[in-house]
Structure formats: C-alpha cells, structure tokens
C-alpha cells in the first residue's frame, strides 16, 4: 500500500516523492533498502535526499532498487517504499510500455494532456511536446503551463505524447522526459436545465448552536463538458463573498461525473460556531448554466438537545 513505482531514463533527472505523507516540519530519512545505507542530504551528491523528495541528478541504471523513506514526527514514524527503475535510453523512437505514464483520453471539447510528474521538478516554461517522437508544430497545439492543449481534436490525434523540460538544481540543468498515451473519445455531450439533487426545496436543516454546520448544494447539468455551469450559495439573496460574515464560507466540492456520464457539481457551505442569528437567514442553493437558474431554499432550525432527565 505504501510502495510506489517510479522510473526514469539514465542521464536524466528523476525526483521521487515518499509515498508516506507528513507535515513539512516532519523529518524524512531515506535509505537504500538492500544495504540499509542512509541516503545523504548534501546536494553535492549525485543522489541525495531533500525532505520528502529523493533526487537523482542525473540518474544511472545502477540506481535501480528499492528505497525506504521514514517520516518521523514527535509521536510516530511512518515507513514508505519507492521502487525505482532506471532504464537505458532507447536508440529508436518507440517508447516501451514500462516507460509510459497513465493514459488520458480527450474529446473535441476537452483535450488537455498533462505532463506527468512535472510538479516534482523545478522547471520553467515552455514545455516541449512531441508526438510519436515528432516535435509538435502548428497553431492547433498550445503548450500552456504544465499541459498541452489540442484544438479541434480528431481521432488522428491519438498517440504517444512526450513532454520534455529542464529541471534546475542550484544552477545546474538536467533534462527530463515523460510519455503518456492519449486516446480520443467521441463525446456526444448535451446540456440540460440544472437539476438540484440536494438540498430539497424548502428543506429545514437542524443545527446546534455553537457547533459547526455544513450544507451541500449539489446539481447536475447534462453530459460531457458543460459551459458556464456552477453551483453556489447565497445568503438572503447576497453572494457569500459580499455578505461579509467570515464564519460562513463556501468551498468547492467534487466535480463529479457519474457512471451514467452526468456532469455534476457540489458546493459546500461551512458555518462555523452556529449563532442564533444564523437561524434567521435564508440560504439559497443556486445551480446555473446556459439554460437557466434553479434555486432551492434552506432554513436552519435549532436542534433541541436530548433531554437526559427522566
């Protein structure tokens, strides 16, 4: 469960994150599992540990093996394992399956290809992108931040996409490449008038004074990518940001896509330390898209504490 596969090419940078997470203040020790030898933290070493990250600058085939990371806090230790494999560079164009990151699929309306693992590196734009080893050229291809956008996607756009970037460590530059497959699906999307799944219209939500309360506004809009679709909360007909009560905040929930393909959105309203005056407010869950606006109103009522007297 706490073991992670990582791979890279010789003479390229490889950075691996410890599969066990901890606060930034926790110390992380790294070991080479076969020898139980500690990985140094000094940056002058080709392979060194830097907190949660293990850096191979650059990597060598001989670095392959299992590395142990131990996250140490004042109260506990957590152990994780990084299974690292460094491969020799291929002379031909083919990228073998074992070097491929997860496949992504796109459609005419949504064609972003993210460069895998790039967040671990200190890189600067622009990224270089290749398809089946050919540099991508033409206005249909746009490298933006850490992803590639393809305009007007066609079935011929399916294939293996490689991103190439430079990692900078203390003034030294190291090349990194990562490849993933892109498939094109025929997305027959549609858009509907919003349907609010929760809360029910005129729902009464019981809350306890002094406690925290959460209200979830959930709505579905159709199938596929939706335009101008949103769910949000209003208080007494006012945007949360304009209402000016710091105890009451809204937080985006999951962008859901159910097995039936419906595109749905959640927005959670968090009320900290519920006060009497909160019971007087009108809470509106709003769902909107191109077709219109639907509104469900909720009111809060005081939950009576259970009477423990006989």
């Amino acid at each position: 469960k706490f073991s992670k596969q990582s791979w890279g090419l010789e003479n390229e940078a490889l950075i691996v994150r410890c599969p066990r997470q901890g606060k930034p203040s926790y110390t992380v020790d790294w070991y080479y599992s076969q020898t139980n030898k500690s990985i140094p933290t000094q940056e002058r070493n080709r392979v060194f540990a830097s907190g949660q990250l293990l850096k191979f600058l650059p990597a060598a085939v001989a670095d392959s093996g299992i590395y142990t990371c131990i996250v140490r806090s004042p109260t506990f230790n957590r152990t994780g394992y990084a299974n690292v494999t460094i491969y020799k560079k291929q002379s031909d164009c083919n990228v073998p399956d074992y070097l491929m990151y997860s496949t992504v699929s796109g459609s005419e309306k949504n064609s972003k290809i993210y460069c895998p693992t790039i967040d671990l590196y200190n890189w600067t734009a622009p990224l270089e992108w290749f398809k089946n080893c050919q540099a991508l050229q033409g206005s249909r291809y746009r490298a933006h931040k850490s992803f590639l956008v393809i305009d007007n996607v066609m079935t011929e756009d399916a294939g293996d996409y490689t991103c190439k970037f430079i990692h900078n460590e203390n003034g030294a530059n190291y090349s990194v490449t990562a490849t993933r497959s892109f498939t094109v699906k025929d997305e027959q999307g549609f858009s509907l008038f919003p349907v609010i799944g929760a809360p029910a219209q005129n729902e009464i939500k019981e809350v306890e004074i002094g406690k925290n309360a959460n209200l979830t506004c959930s709505a579905c809009f159709g199938k596929g990518t939706q335009f101008l679709a949103a769910v949000l909360w209003q208080l007494n007909g006012t945007k949360i940001t304009d209402f000016g009560e710091p105890r009451i905040q809204q937080e985006e929930g999951q962008n859901q896509s159910f097995s039936n393909g419906l595109a749905c959105l959640d927005m959670v309203l968090r009320i900290a330390d519920v006060k009497e005056e909160d019971l007087l407010l009108q809470y509106d869950c709003l769902a909107l898209n191109l077709h219109g606006l639907r509104r469900h109103t909720v009111r809060l009522s005081r939950k009576n504490p259970i009477d423990h007297h006989s």
């Epitope: 949103a230 909107l288 191109l290 077709h291 219109g292």
Partner: antibody
C-alpha cells in the same frame, strides 16, 4: 442610454499580456452577461468567452482556455479581458458585447457592443 | 463546434433592390438560437435579428429573417444606402458560439 465604453488601443510585444476593460454606463450591470469577441484585420468575428457578473462565473472558448481570463467588478460596472502569451496572430480588435437577461434567463445573442479596442502584437 | 457558412461572400445589389443572404449551419440548430448582425467599416457589429426572425429594437421593417434547422436567410426588401455593409450570422444554440465568415453587401 446604455453604453459599453472600452479602454484605448494597445501595442504589445510577443509573449506579453494585455488587459482590456469594458465599462457599462447606464442600466444595471449585474443583470447582463458580458462576452468578448475579437476580429482580426479583414477577418470575421470570433467569440472568446463570457462572464456573468452577478454570479462571478466566467467560461471560455476552448481555443483560448488557459490563455484568457475574464473578470468583472460590479462596484465599477466594469468587465475585463486579459489575454496572455500574446503572439502576432492575436493582433485584432477586441469587442465586449452584452447579453441581456429576460424574465427567464440570459439571451445569448449580443444586443449591445463596445466600440472595440485594437490590440497590436509586434516585436 | 457548429460551423456557420454564409453565401455569397459578396453580394452586389443596386439601391432599392432586394438582397437575400444565406447562412447554413453544419448541424441542426433550433431556430430560436440564430442571430444576424450588421457591421460597417470601423464600427462594431449591430444586432439586427435574433431568434432567426425577431427584429431587434430600432431595426427597420425592411430587414427580415427566416429559416430553421440548418438553413437560414436574411432578407433586405429594399436596400437603402446605409445598408451597404458586412452581415454576419451567429448561432447561440451551443458553445462555442460561432459566427459565419460574413457576406459583404456592396453597391452594384
């Protein structure tokens, strides 16, 4: 008389960003949706994206996704369009255009236009 | 995306004559979602027709729109000097909202 007043012409270098403003005078700004449409020299009209200021929600044509940001300030009745990573092909007149809200919802045609802002991208 | 194709690219008409402009959509759109605009050199577009056939406020009766499905028409019954301009159709049935490439109506 409702008007959409746009900011002045801009000359920009490739790779830079431009931010164009569109101020609504008269009428109720919060009851409009504002879209941005551009027109390259001698070319047709191209829709870029739309914002509904009342809800603070914006969305964009996929061609411009990641490169354009549309915002609105209800207090000044002003909408903004920022386009980054400019290239010579972005040389165009940029229009803001209004969609009015009827009793049911927004009518997504453009019933009022600003006079346009010429953005020239040149090294 | 829905591609809007206008024809002809240029239409030469004498003042007082009738002009018929065509707009074809690459897929069927409800007639409620088609608009026509007029644009004169150096000016912003101006809304003429929405919902395929409803004239916008202040638009003279000589402008009329018709059509449904994929075929739409803008008719100017008797061209006035101020009508010589470029005309664009636009679908707002589904995003991205798209415009035709325009028809230029010029004096014959």
């Amino acid at each position: 008389q409702v008007q959409l007043v746009q900011s002045g012409a801009e000359v920009k270098k490739p790779g830079s960003s431009v931010k164009v403003s569109c101020k609504a005078s008269g009428g109720t700004f919060s009851s409009y949706a504002i879209s941005w449409v551009r027109q390259a020299p001698g070319q047709g009209l191209e829709w870029m994206g739309t914002i509904i200021p009342m809800f603070g929600i914006a969305d964009y044509a996929q061609k411009f996704q990641g490169r354009v940001t549309i915002t609105a300030d209800e207090s000044t009745s002003t909408a903004y369009m920022e386009l980054s990573s400019l290239r010579s092909e972005d040389t165009a007149v940029y229009y803001c255009a209004r969609s009015s809200r009827s009793s049911s919802w927004y009518n997504w045609y453009f019933d009022l236009w600003g006079r346009g802002t010429l953005v020239t991208v040149s090294s | 995306e829905i591609v809007m194709t206008q024809s002809p690219a240029t239409l030469s008409v004498s003042p007082g004559e009738r002009a018929t402009l065509s707009c074809r959509a690459s897929q069927s759109i409800s007639s409620s979602y088609l608009a026509w605009y007029q644009q004169k050199p150096g000016q912003a577009p101006r809304l003429l027709i929405y919902g395929a056939s409803t004239r916008a406020t202040g638009i003279p009766a000589r402008f009329s729109g018709s059509g449904s499905g994929t075929e739409f028409t803008l008719t100017i019954s008797s061209l006035q000097s101020e009508d010589f301009a470029v005309y664009y159709c636009q679908q707002y049935y589904t995003t991205p909202w798209t415009f035709g490439q325009g028809t230029k109506v010029e004096i014959k």
